[in-house]
Interface confidence: medium
C-alpha cells in the first residue's frame, strides 16, 4: 500500500523533520505550513488548524518561505541622488544603489550610508585600480612612453603614437605629435575605458529560519563639492 | 514636527531590570535609527547603542553588549531599551534620539531622558 | 574605539567675545571627503541639541554664530559672539565607526 500523504497539521513521527514549505510549531507540537513570499503569519497553527496567512501590507515584504508574524518594512526611500534598481514589492525589499561614477564609502548592515564620488584621475594621471561598488579609484602616474589627457575616473595610461618624424615629443599627459606624415602607428582614437562599478547591493537580510542570500542597500548622504581630483600634485 | 518621548522615571534594586520606551511621530520610524545614550548625573554622555526600526537590526556598544537588549515595535512606532544586571552605576539619566540612515547621520532630535535610579 | 578628547573643560568668556572649543580624535574620522564628526549643546536638565553635523554644516534654527571646522582628528567649535543664552556645556562626537564616542565636555560660562 502507498504510504499516507499527511495534511498539515500533523505530529511528526519521533526523530523526523517536517516536509519542505513546512515548520514546527514548538507550541502545537505539529508540523504546520509556512507562508508564502509575499504572505506572513496571521494565525499560527493549533492542532486542529493550520496556518492561516495574509498579504504583506504596503510597503513590507517577504522574500522567503516563511512564518514570522509580520512582514519586514521595505528599506528607507532612495534619496534623490540613488537609483532605485528594484522597487518595494511584497516579495523583494527596495534596492537603491548609488548613482553611477559614486561608490560606497561608509556602510552598515542596513547599506550604503555615504555615497562619494570616485576619483577623476588628472591629465598625466591614469586609473590603476578601477573604482568597484565599495571602493575607490586608484591613479597612477604615467610610465614614460604613456600618457592621459583626461579628468577620469575611467582612463588609463595608453602608448605615445610612433612617429616617423617627430614634430612634438609625448609627454605623461600629452600624445606624441608627428610631423604631416602619417605615424607608423597610434592607438585607435578615444581614450581607453575601464568598466564602471555596478553596484547590486540590497537591503536587509531577512530574519527568516531559512538562510537569506539579500545583500544590502546604498544609501546616499548628499554631498559637499567633490574632493579634488588626484594627480595634479602627484599625490 | 520630530518628537521622541520616553517613558517616566523608575527606581530598581541592583540586580533588576529596567525597560525605557521611546515613542516616536513626526516621521516616518522604520525609516531612520533609534540611539540610546546614557548621562550620569554630572557627567558626560555614553551611547548605548542603536536599533533600524525597519529590519530590527541592532548595534551595542560591546561595554553594554549581554546587558542591553534594544527593541522596536513598528505597530505603535516605539522602542525600547532593556538593561538587566543593574548595578550602582547604571543610575543616569537614559536618552532615545533619532540618526537619520542618510543625511546628517547625527543625532537630531532626542528624548526628554528617563532618569533610571539603582539603590538597594 | 575612537577617543575624542576636549579642551579645554570649562571656559569663561564675555558677552560678545569669541569662544573656541576644540575637540581630538584619537584616529581619523574623516571618510571620503567627509569628517563624520558633530557638536551638540546641553543645558542642565535638557537633552543634548545638534547645533553641527559632519563637521561644519549648521543644524537647521541654530544661530549661524555657532560654526565648526577641521578634518580628520582636529576639530573646532567656534562661537562668534557669545550670548547669555549659549551658558551650557559642549560635545563633540563621532559617527565613523561603532561605537559611537563623545567627548568628556567643555562647559562655557560668562566670565
Known amino acids: 500500500l502507498p504510504a499516507q500523504v499527511a495534511f498539515t497539521p500533523y505530529a511528526p513521527e519521533p526523530g523526523s523533520t517536517c516536509r519542505l514549505r513546512e515548520y514546527y510549531d514548538q507550541t502545537a507540537q505539529m508540523c504546520c505550513s509556512k507562508c508564502s513570499p509575499g504572505q506572513h503569519a496571521k494565525v499560527f497553527c493549533t492542532k486542529t488548524s493550520d496556518t492561516v496567512c495574509d498579504s504583506c501590507e504596503d510597503s513590507t515584504y517577504t522574500q522567503l518561505w516563511n512564518w514570522v508574524p509580520e512582514c519586514l518594512s521595505c528599506g528607507s526611500r532612495c534619496s534623490s541622488d540613488q537609483v532605485e534598481t528594484q522597487a518595494c514589492t511584497r516579495e523583494q525589499n527596495r534596492i537603491c544603489t548609488c548613482r553611477p561614477g559614486w561608490y560606497c564609502a561608509l556602510s552598515k548592515q542596513e547599506g550604503c550610508r555615504l555615497c562619494a564620488p570616485l576619483r577623476k584621475c588628472r591629465p598625466g594621471f591614469g586609473v590603476a585600480r578601477p573604482g568597484t561598488e565599495t571602493s575607490d579609484v586608484v591613479c597612477k602616474p604615467c610610465a614614460p612612453g604613456t600618457f592621459s589627457n583626461t579628468t577620469s575616473s575611467t582612463d588609463i595610461c595608453r602608448p605615445h603614437q610612433i612617429c616617423n618624424v617627430v614634430a612634438i615629443p609625448g609627454n605623461a599627459s600629452m600624445d606624441a605629435v608627428c610631423t604631416s606624415t602619417s605615424p607608423t602607428r597610434s592607438m585607435a582614437p578615444g581614450a581607453v575605458h575601464l568598466p564602471q562599478p555596478v553596484s547590486t547591493r540590497s537591503q536587509h537580510t531577512q530574519p527568516t529560519p531559512e538562510p537569506s542570500t539579500a545583500p544590502s542597500t546604498s544609501f546616499l548622504l548628499p554631498m559637499g563639492p567633490s574632493p579634488p581630483a588626484e594627480g595634479s600634485t602627484g599625490d | 514636527q520630530v518628537q521622541l518621548v520616553q517613558s517616566g522615571a523608575e527606581v530598581k534594586k541592583p540586580g533588576a531590570s529596567v525597560k525605557v520606551s521611546c515613542k516616536a511621530s513626526?516621521?516616518?520610524?522604520?525609516?531612520?535609527?533609534i540611539d540610546w545614550v546614557r548621562q550620569a548625573t554630572g557627567q558626560g554622555l555614553e551611547w548605548i547603542g542603536e536599533?533600524?526600526?525597519?529590519?530590527?537590526?541592532?548595534y551595542y556598544n560591546e561595554k553594554f553588549k549581554g546587558r542591553a537588549t534594544l527593541t522596536a515595535n513598528k505597530s505603535i512606532s516605539t522602542a525600547y531599551m532593556e538593561l538587566s544586571s543593574l548595578r550602582s552605576e547604571d543610575t543616569a539619566v537614559y536618552f532615545c534620539?533619532?540618526?537619520?540612515?542618510?543625511?546628517?547621520?547625527?543625532?537630531?532630535?532626542w528624548g526628554q531622558g528617563t532618569l533610571v535610579t539603582v539603590s538597594s | 574605539d575612537i577617543v575624542m578628547t576636549q579642551s579645554p573643560d570649562s571656559l569663561a568668556v564675555s558677552l560678545g567675545e569669541r569662544a573656541t572649543i576644540n575637540c581630538r580624535a584619537s584616529e581619523s574620522v574623516d571618510n571620503s571627503g567627509n569628517s563624520f564628526m558633530h557638536w551638540y549643546q546641553q543645558k542642565p536638565g535638557q537633552p543634548p541639541k545638534l547645533l553641527i553635523y559632519?563637521?561644519?554644516n549648521l543644524e537647521s534654527g541654530v544661530p549661524d554664530r555657532f560654526s565648526g571646522s577641521g578634518a580628520r582628528t582636529d576639530f573646532t567649535l567656534t562661537i562668534s559672539s557669545l550670548q547669555a543664552e549659549d551658558v551650557a556645556v559642549y560635545y563633540c562626537q563621532q559617527s565613523k565607526e561603532d561605537p559611537y564616542t563623545f567627548g568628556q565636555g567643555t562647559k562655557v560660562e560668562i566670565k
Open positions: 536599533i533600524y526600526p525597519g529590519s530590527g537590526n541592532t
Open positions: 534620539a533619532r540618526s537619520q540612515v542618510y543625511g546628517k547621520i547625527a543625532m537630531d532630535h
Open positions: 513626526g516621521y516616518t520610524f522604520t525609516d531612520d535609527y
Open positions: 559632519r563637521a561644519s
